[in-house]
Interface confidence: medium
Amino acid sequence: SYSMEHFRWGKPVGKKRRPVKVYPNGAEDESAEAFPLEF
């Protein structure tokens, strides 16, 4: 299973964007896969 943790975008410069998390199975106990910061 997969879950996407919040991460903050560093591009374009000065814009911090937070993605919405993914809960593909609707479960609370999904393992978290974190996306790295991108600059």
Epitope: Y2, M4, H6, W9, K15, K16, R17, R18, P19, V20, K21, V22, Y23, P24, N25, G26, E28
Partner: antibody, heavy 110, light 112 residues
Framework: QSLEESGGRLVTPGTSLTLTCTAS????????ILWVRQAPGKGLESIGM?????DTYYATWAKGRFIISRTSTTMDLKIISPTTEDTATYFC???????WGQGTLVTVSS | DIVMTQIPASVEAAVGGTVTIKCQAS??????LAWYQQKPGQPPKLLIY???TLASGVPSRFKGSGSGTEFTLTIGDLECADAATYYC??????????????FGGGTEVVVK
């Protein structure tokens, strides 16, 4: 786990209306919750969302028209001054997921 | 705000055939794209997330591809049960000056 929307009804233009999203099996405050609407026979339209930490963001067209808030057990969507164009089924969604409510129908008519 | 353009609006194909739906984002969203299936009177059902990852229980006949601004959903070996409207959704994220969650206009799939 499930979500249920409530509060949809027939209202006259300009009469504010608050819709409520209630979760079963999990805590709303621990997840990102998105509000989406769908006018009859039309496509899906993203209104805005609240992150688990309480930050809220709105589509540009929705700013000033809707307010998303939450209590310890519910997530609310207030339609500030409805117009006939706000007639739609309103869904709350747990992030990007298979968990959508069944929707609540709002009809705005004079 | 992100704008998602989805084509075609409607497509018809025979049982056993293949349908391809395209979705274009107004700016790069990397792989932050989901595909949903919606049938009348029901809420949407998640098919694919991260552009190409199948959600739980979704048959491998459904395939998502693409990244950046161009994405594709391919449905192979069509079944009557696949008749529905399909939507793409970006979830690139948001800031005070940008809202990255948007849906395509939908594609109605008619199975003959």
């Amino acid at each position: 786990q499930s979500l249920e929307e409530s509060g949809g009804r027939l209202v006259t233009p300009g009469t504010s209306l608050t819709l409520t999203c209630t979760a079963s099996g999990f805590s709303l405050s621990a997840y990102d919750i998105l509000w989406v609407r769908q006018a009859p026979g039309k496509g899906l339209e993203s209104i805005g969302m609240m992150y688990d930490d309480g930050d809220t963001y709105y589509a540009t067209w929705a700013k000033g028209r809707f307010i998303i808030s939450r209590t310890s057990t519910t997530m609310d969507l207030k339609i500030i001054s409805p117009t006939t164009e706000d007639t739609a089924t309103y869904f709350c969604v747990k992030g990007v997921s298979n968990i959508w409510g069944q929707g609540t129908l709002v009809t705005v008519s004079s | 705000d992100i704008v998602m353009t989805q084509i075609p609006a409607s497509v018809e194909a025979a049982v056993g055939g293949t349908v391809t739906i395209k979705c274009q984002a107004s700016q790069s969203i990397d792989s932050s794209l989901a595909w949903y299936q919606q049938k009348p009177g029901q809420p949407p059902k998640l098919l694919i997330y991260s552009a190409s990852t199948l959600a739980s229980g979704v048959p491998s006949r459904f395939k998502g591809s693409g990244s950046g601004t161009e994405f594709t959903l391919t449905i192979g070996d069509l079944e009557c049960a696949d008749a529905a409207t399909y939507y793409c959704q970006s979830y690139d994220g948001s800031s005070s000056s940008y809202y990255g969650i948007g849906f395509g206009g939908g594609t109605e799939v008619v199975v003959k």
